[in-house]
């Protein structure tokens, strides 16, 4: 009569995490007498999964009634599969022996692969803001997926990015994997409303990729541009000078007026005008009593934005010769002679 063969018909079985896995095994003969066991892995160090003879295996059930007379089906089902269950499973026939049973024959093995979904990608940006034309890095992380094959793409406002580096860990065999990617993005002035998206595609997602997003508004600082101008006034002894603070982001801004280097007034920007690109504008004005000055006045608008070093713009307000001679007594002939704004940044 032919010697017993152990048949494991499937070379591989793939199961989604949380499901049950059925591992099939059949014998061609009832002899020799002895139990069957299932192991994960082969050789020294293999892990016992099920022993027909003894033991408690709460996640394992037999497909057939093993005690049934003439039973040759030794298939098992393992419940609630996790990535840690991945591996090659061997159905092994033992021959009754004394004191211990002896391994008689093994099946060829069934490789169980576990499909586990990646976690929702988490995108994080730089710790400090950067200004336009500078490059910032965004990272994207996802964990717990299996198998290892995974695709990650980066987008900025729907346009695919190419400057990124991705690692999948660990490099070798593992029950599950993690992905880490770093993208480099060059900031532009219009990026306040921009978004970066990390998109992950994996076999478990059935063509519906996972996305993680980050707003460039968290990463960008657009420094303001300053313009100091003089507005026409009816009263000859007064000058109205405005400081137009334009296209800045984020909101936080403090403005100080200086007359000939001395602080005249400090104010914090409150009512801001938002531009279409997400940046803000703000205007501050200073009323100067020209009668109080015998000499020309240098007015400086100094702006501290988002905790950065202050920038400033100056304006030379000329006091007419007529006013200089007569001082504050002469008001009606006071002439305001505006000059070109003086550029300057502190």
């Amino acid at each position: 009569e032919d010697e017993l063969q152990v048949i494991q018909p499937e070379k591989s079985v793939s199961v989604a995490a949380g499901e049950s896995a059925t591992l099939r095994c059949a014998m061609t003969s009832l002899i020799p007498v002895g139990p069957i066991m299932w192991f994960r892995g082969a050789g020294a160090g293999r892990e016992l999964i099920y022993n027909q003879k003894e033991g408690h295996f709460p996640r394992v059930t037999t497909v057939s009634e093993l005690t049934k007379r003439n039973n040759l089906d030794f298939s098992i089902s393992i419940s609630n599969i996790t990535p840690a269950d991945a591996g090659t499973y061997y159905c092994v026939k033992f021959r009754k022996g004394s004191p211990d049973d002896v391994e008689f024959k093994s099946g060829a093995g069934t490789e169980l692969s576990v499909r586990a979904k990646p976690s929702a990608p988490v995108v994080s940006g730089p710790a400090v803001r950067a200004t336009p034309e500078h490059t910032v890095s965004f990272t994207c992380e996802s964990h717990g997926f299996s198998p290892r094959d995974i695709t990650l793409k980066w987008f900025k406002n729907g346009n695919e990015l190419s400057d990124f580096q991705t690692n999948v860990d660990p490099a070798g065999d593992s029950v599950s994997y993690s992905i880490h990617s770093t993208a480099r993005v060059v900031l532009t002035r219009g990026d306040v409303h921009s978004q970066v998206i990390c998109e992950i595609a994996h076999i478990t997602l059935q063509g519906d990729p996972l996305r993680g997003t980050a707003n460039l508004s968290e990463a960008i600082r657009v420094p303001p541009t300053l313009e100091v101008t003089q507005q026409p006034m009816r009263a000859e002894n007064q000058a109205n000078v405005t400081c137009q603070v334009s296209n800045f982001y984020p909101r936080g801004l403090q403005l100080t007026w200086l007359e000939n280097g001395n602080v005249s007034r400090t104010e914090t920007a409150s009512t801001l005008i938002e531009n279409k690109d997400g940046t803000y504008n703000w205007m501050s004005w200073l009323l100067v009593n020209t009668c109080a000055h015998r000499d020309d006045v240098v007015l400086t608008c100094q702006v501290e934005h988002d905790g950065q070093q202050a920038v400033s713009k100056s304006y030379a307000l000329e006091i007419s010769a007529h006013q200089k001679e007569h001082g504050s007594d002469i008001t009606h002939e006071a002439a305001l002679a505006p000059t070109a704004p003086l550029g300057g940044s502190g």
């Epitope: 082969a42 050789g43 020294a44 160090g45 591996g87 093994s106 093995g109 490789e111 593992s174």
Partner: antibody, heavy 122, light 112 residues
Framework: QVQLQESGPGLVRPSETLSLTCTVS????????WSWIRQPPGKGLEWIGF???????FYNPSLKSRVTISLDMSINQFSLKMTSVTAADTAVYYC????????????????WGQGTTVTVSS | DIVMTQSPLSLPVTPGEPASISCKSS???????????LDWYLQRPGQSPQLLIY???NRASGVPDRFSGSGSGTDFTLKISRVEAEDVGVYYC?????????FGGGTKVEIK
């Protein structure tokens, strides 16, 4: 580059407990078996036992009653404790990494420590 | 336990010449997955052992191609195609089919 470093007392009194630690640097403990092997002076190699990163242990039956292998993944270390030592336990003790693949099993002890000499003497 | 028997005990070699070491196991190391659970190690004088061959015939990373492993079941051979001075030391075979892992007694290779 993974490196293993054994540490522990070089001299142990008879009937006392031998304790050795192996520190794994430059790599992870995950997905490997971690082995202890010894070599008495002028003799061959003897496998003591190993531990999988999940904590499953396998011991040489000839030493099983006296040996415990444990690991601490948080500090990348695994340890050997051998009780009731005698002069026959005098040897160079090696810790080693054993590669393992789920579909194959063990496929080579590919990284070894430099070994630490333990003498059992009163 | 599986008993591993190596021969010869000592092997004097001439540099540039081939050398061969035999290892026999008391039971087959060939499993149903078609792998032979046998490794070869070299222990140079005063050093730790190093892996040469795993699973019967696979050369470990960084091992020169003058080393090769062959055989199946119970009979295995390690061959060095052209011996070099750095190849001296004790060669061990080890079975990894079942615990306890067991080593052969070793073959000492020395230059003539």
């Amino acid at each position: 580059q993974v490196q293993l470093q054994e540490s522990g007392p070089g001299l142990v009194r008879p009937s006392e407990t031998l304790s050795l630690t192996c520190t794994v640097s430059g790599g992870s403990i995950r997905n490997y078996y971690w082995s202890w092997i010894r070599q008495p002076p002028g003799k061959g190699l003897e496998w003591i036992g190993f531990i999988y990163y999940t904590g499953r242990t396998f011991y040489n039956p000839s030493l099983k009653s006296r040996v415990t292998i444990s690991l601490d993944m948080s500090i990348n270390q695994f340890s050997l404790k051998m009780t009731s030592v005698t002069a026959a336990d005098t040897a160079v003790y090696y810790c080693a990494r054993v590669r393992a693949y789920s579909g194959i099993g063990l496929d080579g002890t590919d990284v070894w420590g430099q070994g630490t000499t333990v003498t059992v003497s009163s | 336990d599986i008993v591993m028997t190596q021969s010869p005990l000592s092997l004097p070699v001439t540099p540039g010449e081939p050398a061969s070491i035999s290892c026999k196991s008391s039971q087959s190391l060939l499993y149903s997955n078609a792998y032979n659970y046998l490794d070869w190690y070299l222990q140079r004088p005063g050093q730790s052992p190093q892996l040469l061959i795993y699973l019967g015939s696979n050369r470990a990373s960084g091992v020169p191609d003058r080393f090769s492993g062959s055989g199946s079941g119970t009979d295995f051979t390690l061959k060095i195609s052209r011996v070099e001075a750095e190849d001296v030391g004790v060669y061990y075979c080890m079975q990894a089919l079942q615990t306890p892992l067991t080593f052969g007694g070793g073959t000492k290779v020395e230059i003539k």
